[in-house]
């Protein structure tokens, strides 16, 4: 059955980020995950990040150099933004950004969170807090071992998500992430918005940016 | 309830100096960025740099060392300040920020 | 710096049809776009935000979609008041840049 996974907070205060280990999903087909740029709280300095879906070996040196593939970037203090990334078996045109079972995906920011870091290419909270989240798609949570894991890139959307259409398994080598320090995102139903939508919040806003 | 008000002159010589002040009201400027557009008669948007919450400033480089923005947060004022101007700068300029913008102030530069 | 286009540059349509305008980003921008609408004499107005999130008090009607480079504004049933020109804007990096506009006109 499809789920909307536990949404995941784009925070250096999240603690699934604080443990110092990467953050570990597991998604099915049909599964929605919200990527959440939280909007800024009173006394708190606002958060400046750029979330890129990498290649497994961007996300082991903490490097968005090399053709990086931008998702969504959190610059708008007034209000919350919400990425939503869909995980569908088909891709609804050529554009589409195709996830294929049983492999490893990756997603983090080479930001360090201040406004003049943002465009930060190398590093950033990707090396300082492992805020990284890394997607195992159709994969088992009990059953799986890095030798199992072969990885790919996908190619870019052009929809309001990520829609990400799997399909059978390539054989690119056995890149998945072999550290074994990952937080892991149970699987439960949320309620909530599971929006469609790249992104929503309140108040909505246009402006807050750089 | 969030609101922004721009003021400054209609006209302006050629060469000289634009100063609009936007004053703002509802929010803090230390949460929202404030940001400056403009439209020449009849054509669209553009946008020329914004003031982010922290204090920093960014600017769009087609308006090279020309253009400086400031604020004085106890007064809730940002500040454009556009020297040489020429012709071409005759536009509308608005400040905004996430869903409201100011009703603009009509600038002519005239020789 | 970010050129985005939009197209076609103006269009006629009839009370309740339906039209779709087009912004498409020099590179790649993730979600980080906005349209806005703009009527005659006034100052622009947040549609869609994020892309494809409907401002509040923003009508169904109105409908954002895309990412990476290919964006849309759709807009369903159109309303006599929804005469104006309407703006594409990316503001992922610096310099944040507008489309140059859409004009919508009503037979």
């Known amino acids: 059955l499809a789920k909307n996974l536990e949404p995941v907070s784009w925070s250096s205060l999240n603690p699934k980020f604080l443990s110092g280990k990467g953050l570990v999903i597991y998604p099915k087909i049909g599964d929605k995950l919200d990527i959440i740029c939280p909007r800024a709280e009173a006394g708190r300095p606002y958060e400046y990040y750029k979330l890129y879906l990498v290649r497994p070996e961007q996300a082991a040196a903490c490097s968005t150099v090399l053709d990086p593939n931008v998702l969504v970037t959190c610059n708008r203090p007034e209000q919350e933004i919400r990425f939503t990334i869909k995980f569908q078996e088909f891709s609804p045109n050529y554009m589409g950004l195709e996830f294929k079972k049983h492999h490893d995906y990756y997603i983090t920011s080479t930001s360090n969170g201040s406004l003049e870091g943002l465009e930060n290419r190398e590093g950033g909270v990707c090396r300082t807090r492992t805020m990284k989240i890394i997607m195992k798609v159709g994969q088992d949570p009990n059953a799986v071992t890095p030798e199992q894991l072969t990885t790919s890139r996908p190619s870019k959307e052009a929809d309001n998500t990520v829609k990400m259409a799997t399909q059978a398994p390539g054989s690119r080598g056995s890149l998945g992430d072999s550290d074994g320090k990952h937080e892991t995102v149970n699987q439960e139903e949320k309620s909530g918005p599971g929006a469609s939508g790249g992104s929503s919040g309140d108040p909505d806003g246009f402006f807050n940016s750089k | 309830q969030v609101q922004l008000k721009e003021t400054g002159p209609d006209l302006v010589h050629l060469t000289q100096t634009l100063s609009i002040t936007c004053t703002v009201s509802?929010?803090?400027?230390?949460?929202?960025?404030i940001h400056w557009v403009r439209q020449p008669p009849g054509k669209g948007l553009e946008w020329m740099g914004a003031?982010?919450?922290?204090?920093?400033?960014d600017y769009n480089s087609a308006f090279k060392s020309r253009l400086s923005i400031s604020r004085d947060t106890s007064k809730s004022q940002v500040f454009l300040k556009m020297n040489s101007l020429q012709t071409d700068d005759t536009a509308k300029y608005f400040c905004?920020?996430?869903?409201?913008w100011g009703q603009g102030v009509m600038v002519t530069v005239s020789s | 710096e970010t050129v985005m286009t939009q197209s076609p540059t103006s269009m006629s349509t009839s009370i309740g049809e339906r039209v779709t305008l087009n912004c498409k980003a020099s590179?790649?921008?993730?979600?980080?776009v906005d349209w806005y609408q703009q009527t005659p004499g006034q100052s622009p107005k947040l549609l869609i935000y994020?892309?494809?999130s409907r401002h509040t008090g923003v009508p169904d009607r109105f409908t954002g979609s895309g990412f990476g480079r290919d964006f849309t504004l759709t807009i369903t049933n159109v309303e006599a008041e929804d005469l104006a020109v309407y703006y594409c804007?990316?503001?992922?990096?610096?310099?944040?840049?507008f489309g140059s506009g859409t004009r919508l006109e009503i037979k």
């Open positions: 905004a920020t996430p869903t409201d």
């Open positions: 994020g892309a494809s």
């Open positions: 590179q790649s921008v993730g979600i980080n």
């Open positions: 509802g929010f803090s400027l230390t949460t929202y960025n």
């Open positions: 804007l990316h503001y992922g990096s610096i310099p944040f840049t």
């Open positions: 003031m982010w919450n922290g204090g920093g400033t």
